[in-house]
């Protein structure tokens, strides 16, 4: 079986499908211990499909955001673009590279007064549970012919987390995306690593619930850092501020 692969801590995910969420700062989804490609998913083949089409920032990688490739380009065609470094112009947080956020139209460094925890986690954890649009930027979405009159329950197909009922997020499962429960305290979560090591997970976890963050489990008996599990843990003394 693939359990041995599933139980390993995956590193990063290629973006999932149109209209959905992936492992991007601010994402609804945490890459689960998943099936990685290349290197073990004997059930999957994947063609080279760069650039990656997208409808939301969440579909793109950690160092990318979703936008039209040309200024004033076709609104219906958006792809994942490289994030913007410090002091570059921006319209929303996701446009800025990890460790930065968008303030007054410019990517600026995230400091500990504004964001809690490690720089690597700050944007994901500060904005991951906030599904509202940041900086007044209205996101363009891809509408399906299926209208979601009621919010999706566990196992329902979704395009984005807002399609799911409270306590659930939209995460990849096999070749679809479904509503899965947001993680509770003590549950295993997946920390997003820096860009590179492009694995494709076909299983994703949700983010940690309200008041929780994904941190290394404090276990002094672990032999090495690389084998340490991340779990959802209560915030410590850091204050939590949203930027609007």
């Amino acid at each position: 079986t693939l359990n041995s692969v599933l139980n390993s801590n995956a590193i990063k995910n290629l973006p999932p499908p149109l209209g959905g969420a992936a492992g991007h700062p601010g994402s609804a989804v945490s890459a689960a211990p998943g099936i990685l490609y290349p290197g073990g998913n004997k059930y999957q083949t994947i063609d080279n499909y760069q650039p990656y089409p997208c409808a939301e920032d969440e579909e793109c990688g950690t160092d990318e955001y979703c936008a039209s490739p040309t200024r004033g380009g076709d609104a219906g065609v958006q792809i994942c673009l490289a994030c913007r470094k410090r002091r570059k112009r921006c319209m929303r947080h996701a446009m800025c590279c990890p460790g930065n956020y968008c303030k007054n139209g410019i990517c600026v460094s995230s400091d500990q007064n504004h964001f809690r925890g490690e720089i690597e986690e700050t944007i994901t954890e500060s904005f991951g549970n906030d599904h509202s649009t940041l900086d007044g930027y209205s996101r363009r979405t891809t509408l399906s012919s299926k209208m979601y009159h009621t919010k999706g329950q566990e196992g329902s197909v979704c395009l984005r987390s807002s399609d799911c009922a409270s306590g659930l997020c939209c995460a990849r499962h096999f070749w679809s995306k479904i509503c899965k429960p947001v993680l509770k305290e003590g549950q295993v979560c997946t920390k997003h690593r820096r860009k590179g090591s492009h694995g494709l997970e076909i299983f994703q976890r949700c983010y940690c619930g309200e008041g929780l963050s994904c941190r290394i489990q404090k276990d002094h008996h672990q032999a090495s850092n690389s084998s340490r599990l991340h779990t959802c843990q209560r915030h410590h003394h850091h204050h939590h501020h949203h930027h609007h």
Partner: antibody
């Protein structure tokens, strides 16, 4: 109304090839995963291949390297190219999709493939 | 891969009776807080029809007499009162792990 209509089945000799089609309607085809599932005569169901809305493809070992799933979103069509066919590939082939939940919640009526000399 | 074993192979009952079908998985099909077990009904010459997903949730348009229960490795499909149109073959299927696999089926026949 969601509809999936398979076609392309028939009699083929061992080692031969066949291309199955599935015409979809009633939903935004490009947004959803779609799969092939088969059923040998008098037997149970077996997953054959899937393609996601983001175009990656999946196969079990039994058909990998011989079958290729593909989709044409402009034509709302799914295909299964079957090469190096064997007697054990004889089955009714269904296309199925997952529109409302992760299971195979909508199915076509199937097309019959017979591999025999 | 996860192997699903259904029992009994054949169930002989009369209309109005309660049918209880079992499906056992070779390993747990629970993950992410969901039991990834589904049930399908298939009549001769027809395509399968989804009855239950996530162990206990009803598919669209499925009558209330069909219900599912269980978690981990043991699952049950219950038909509270058999209607004439319910005599068919029933398959369980797991979606926890690739490849998705089906059980061998239980035939519910008229006694």
């Amino acid at each position: 109304e969601v509809q999936l209509v398979e076609s392309g089945g028939g009699l083929v000799q061992p080692g031969g090839s066949l291309r199955l089609s599935c015409a979809a309607s009633g939903f935004t085809f490009s947004s959803y995963a779609i799969s092939w599932v088969r059923q040998a005569p008098g037997k149970g169901l077996e997953w054959v291949a899937s393609v996601s809305g983001w175009l990656d493809t999946y196969y079990p070992d039994s058909v990998k390297g011989r079958f290729t799933i593909s989709r044409d979103n402009a034509k709302n069509s799914l295909y299964l190219q079957m090469n190096s066919l064997r007697a054990e590939d004889t089955a009714v082939y269904y296309c199925a999709t997952s529109l409302e939940n992760y299971a195979f919640d909508y199915w076509g009526q199937g097309t019959t493939v017979t591999v025999s000399s | 891969e996860i192997v699903l074993t259904q029992s009994p192979a054949t169930l002989s009952l009369s209309p109005g009776e309660r049918a209880t079908l079992s499906c056992r998985a070779s390993e747990s099909v629970d993950d992410f807080g969901i039991s990834f077990m589904n049930w399908y009904q298939q009549k001769p010459g027809q395509a399968p029809r989804l009855l239950i997903y996530a162990a206990s949730k009803q598919g669209s348009g499925i009558p209330a007499r069909f219900s599912g229960s269980g978690s981990g490795t043991d699952f049950t499909l219950t038909i509270s009162s058999l209607e004439p149109e319910d005599f068919a073959v029933y398959y369980c299927q797991q979606s926890k792990e690739v490849p998705p696999t089906f059980g061998g089926g239980t035939k519910v026949e008229i006694k």
